[in-house]
């Protein structure tokens, strides 16, 4: 009998409200033995895969997805999923990334000003949908 795969978790560092032009890292976590972590954006058709998986603890593995310079277009809902042969896990909860105007001044990143975004309720996806394996050799639209 195949093992039940635990749901992955997702977090963002340093947080979920990021100044325009600053960097953010999404951290996906799952059990040991994960081969591929996938960070999905808004829908399953937009994602990034990585096999750069490290062991976070004796029982957990993790992958980090970094955006070096956050733009307004990076705002949205993100979630994680992983592939532990021979199957894919279910999705993590959604995490919402908000982009805020940087505080300004001569030392701020050289980026176009964006609209200020206040904190919002982070939606959660508790569905248990099956996730079809990614087609080898095909790549959906990249996240960034």
């Amino acid at each position: 009998q195949e093992e039940d795969l635990p749901r992955p978790s997702i977090s963002a560092e340093p947080g979920t409200v990021i100044p325009l032009g600053s960097h953010v890292t999404f951290v996906c976590r799952g059990p040991v033995g994960v081969q591929t972590f996938r960070l999905e954006r808004d829908s399953r058709s937009t994602y990034n895969d990585t096999e750069d998986v490290s062991q976070a603890s004796p029982s957990e593995s993790e992958a980090r997805f970094r955006i070096d310079s956050v733009r307004e277009g990076n705002a949205g809902l993100y979630r994680c999923i992983y592939y532990k042969p021979p199957k894919w896990s279910e999705q993590s909860d959604y995490l919402e990334l908000l982009v805020k105007e940087s505080s300004g001044g001569p030392d701020s990143p050289d980026t176009e000003p964006g609209s200020s975004a206040g904190p919002t309720q982070r939606p959660s996806d508790n569905s248990h949908n099956e996730h079809a394996p990614a087609s080898q050799g095909l790549k959906a639209e990249h996240l960034y």
């Epitope: 560092e13 340093p14 947080g15 600053s22 960097h23 890292t25 940087s102 001044g105 030392d107 701020s108």
Partner: antibody, heavy 118, light 108 residues
């Protein structure tokens, strides 16, 4: 009023273990990340790690393996093992999440002193 | 591993004067830098975050700025109550969380 308070400090022999407890009131641990920071006598602040709202933990590289953070609905524990004299310090529990940043701390406990000595 | 180098280790200034503290990051941390004040026997108090934004209730005598990976913290119109140790901290990531070594400010 919102507050955090550490307890469980004291004298421990080298090689021993100790669990510190941070008790929170006035807010929910399901809404805030909680961190641990320590300060050796007369020295600077040293970040240990934190526990995310949903229970995921992150640690400083030097703390991995010997320090474990866990939580209940109203407390956050720091379990320390294989203690050495270099672990002698005041241990602070702090609430993260200021300006929505995980490890930006604006609410701290008074600290609890841990002394490692034979 | 990221290192925050804070200078000077100690500084003395007169009431009404100005003190400047520097914090150099060994790698890029964007503007993810905070400044804390700590008085003897007390926990730290958050003063500034995002390099230059004042935390709630902090007077405008406290100011922070950033130039690349170098951060500056200034206290103007010094008061006796400002005598304390000040720390910079990066909250960039759990892989790079760090505090500077601290600067003790004495008021003459």
């Amino acid at each position: 009023e919102q507050s955090v308070e550490e307890s469980g400090g004291g004298l421990v022999a080298p090689g021993g273990s100790l669990t510190l407890t941070c008790t929170v009131s006035g807010f929910s641990l399901s809404n805030y990340h909680m961190g641990w920071v320590r300060q050796a006598p007369g020295k600077g602040l040293e970040w240990i790690g934190y526990i995310y709202t949903h229970g995921t933990t992150f640690y400083a590289s030097w703390a991995k393996g010997r320090f474990t953070i866990s939580k209940t609905s109203t407390t956050v524990d720091l379990k320390m093992t294989r203690l050495t004299t270099g672990d002698t310090a005041t241990y602070f529990c702090a609430r993260g999440g200021y300006a929505d940043y995980n490890i930006l701390y604006n609410l701290w406990g008074p600290g609890t002193l841990v002394t490692i000595s034979s | 591993e990221l290192v925050l180098t804070q200078t000077p280790a100690s500084v003395e200034a007169a009431v009404g004067g100005t003190v400047t503290i520097n914090c150099q990051a060994s790698q890029s941390i964007s503007s993810y830098l905070a400044w804390y004040q700590q008085k003897p026997g007390q926990p730290p108090k958050l003063l500034i975050y995002d390099a230059s934004d004042l935390a709630s209730g902090v007077p405008s005598r406290f100011k922070g700025s950033r130039s690349g990976t170098e951060f500056t913290f200034t206290i103007s119109d010094l008061e006796c109550a400002d005598a304390a140790t000040y720390y910079c901290q990066t909250y960039d990531s759990s892989t790079t969380a760090a505090f500077g070594g601290g600067t003790e400010v004495e008021i003459k």
